[in-house]
């Protein structure tokens, strides 16, 4: 198996551009997490779907932020305008 | 039915500590992110705080960072907002409401601080 | 901090009238939320994301725009709808109002 796999490895952008992440869960895990890392806040939840229903995005409560989860095996991570402050690692998980 | 609860407000002296709780009920608390707001006397809303549902996203007006901390309690079903060092320009009625619909979907009736000697 | 203006700040107008309040961000925003509040009560959201009416919401009101510059509309005033209204942001933090626009019986 390989795991979960998640794309873009590295993103640059400028402030103001929109950044899509997307990540592909293991195959037959129903509940897939996004997450944010940063030195400051430490790790943070986002969001996690259940069976591709968003259950709890209050862990993004800025409207930049937006998640889709639109199939069992993709989810997106959108950010639009994004802010230096947005700088971080996102690693996206899944379990059954 | 979604009821708030606010409590904890009274008078206190300017340097003076209040801790505000918020009590919850006719939801799943633990699923929700939830606000601070307040209001003086003859003004407008101003946002205080937000925690998410897990306590691991906290956001603070730039003013109040180190002066107030806001926290909660989901086996209580408690939202918290511990105010230190107390100024004159706090006074007002501070309202917790639930984060919804990507705002602020209800809200509680409010509990009244007043900072004053 | 993204600034929110209302305009007016002040609004007089009769039962049956169409009224129409701004909201101007500093910054462009992604949705802006309106709020319904009376004297001495909390807070009521209206309208979520722009144009999305809150449940229990009466379709008088409406809610439009992007960018920096979104409307709350009323078609019709009824007794009811006099009282102040907020816009607020969450676009980024902090989450700003706007000051505020009381409605008045003329």
């Known amino acids: 198996d390989a795991g979960v796999i998640q794309s873009p490895r590295h993103e640059v952008t400028e402030m103001g551009q929109e950044v899509t992440l997307r990540c592909k869960p293991i195959s037959g895990h129903n509940s897939l997490f996004w997450y944010r890392q940063t030195m400051m806040r430490g790790l943070e939840l986002l969001i996690y779907f259940n069976n591709n229903v968003p259950i709890d995005d209050s862990g993004m409560p800025e409207d930049r932020f937006s998640a889709k989860m639109p199939n069992a095996s993709f989810s997106t991570l959108k950010i639009q305008p994004s802010e230096p402050r947005d700088s971080a690692v996102y690693f996206c998980a899944s379990s059954l | 039915e979604v009821q708030l609860v606010e409590s904890g407000g009274g008078l206190v002296q300017p340097g003076g500590s209040l801790r505000l709780s918020c009590a919850a009920s006719?939801?799943?608390?633990?699923?929700?992110?939830m606000h601070w707001v307040r209001q003086a006397p003859g003004k407008g809303l101003e946002w205080v705080s937000y925690?998410?549902?897990?306590?691991?996203?906290?956001y603070y007006a730039d003013t109040l960072k180190g002066r107030f901390t806001i926290s909660r309690d989901n086996s209580k079903n408690t939202l918290y907002l511990q105010m230190n060092s107390l100024r004159a320009e706090d006074t007002a009625v501070y309202y917790c409401?639930?984060?919804?619909?990507?705002?602020?979907?209800?809200w509680g009736q409010g509990t009244t601080v007043t900072v004053s000697s | 901090d993204n600034q929110l203006t209302q305009s007016p700040s002040f609004l007089s107008a009769s039962v049956g009238d169409r009224v129409t309040i701004t909201c101007r961000a500093s910054s462009s925003v992604n949705y802006i939320y309106w709020y319904q509040q009376k004297p001495g009560k909390a807070p009521k959201l209206l309208i979520y994301?722009?144009?999305n009416l809150a449940p229990g919401v009466p379709s008088r009101f409406s809610g439009s725009g992007s960018g920096n510059e979104y409307t709350l509309t009323i078609s019709s005033l009824q007794p009811e709808d006099f009282a102040t209204y907020y816009c607020q942001q969450f676009t980024s933090s902090p989450f700003t109002f706007g000051q505020g626009t009381k409605l008045e019986i003329k």
């Open positions: 925690i998410s549902s897990g306590s691991r996203t906290i």
């Open positions: 006719g939801f799943t608390f633990s699923n929700f992110g």
């Open positions: 409401a639930r984060r919804g619909e990507g705002a602020m979907d209800y």
């Open positions: 994301y722009t144009s």
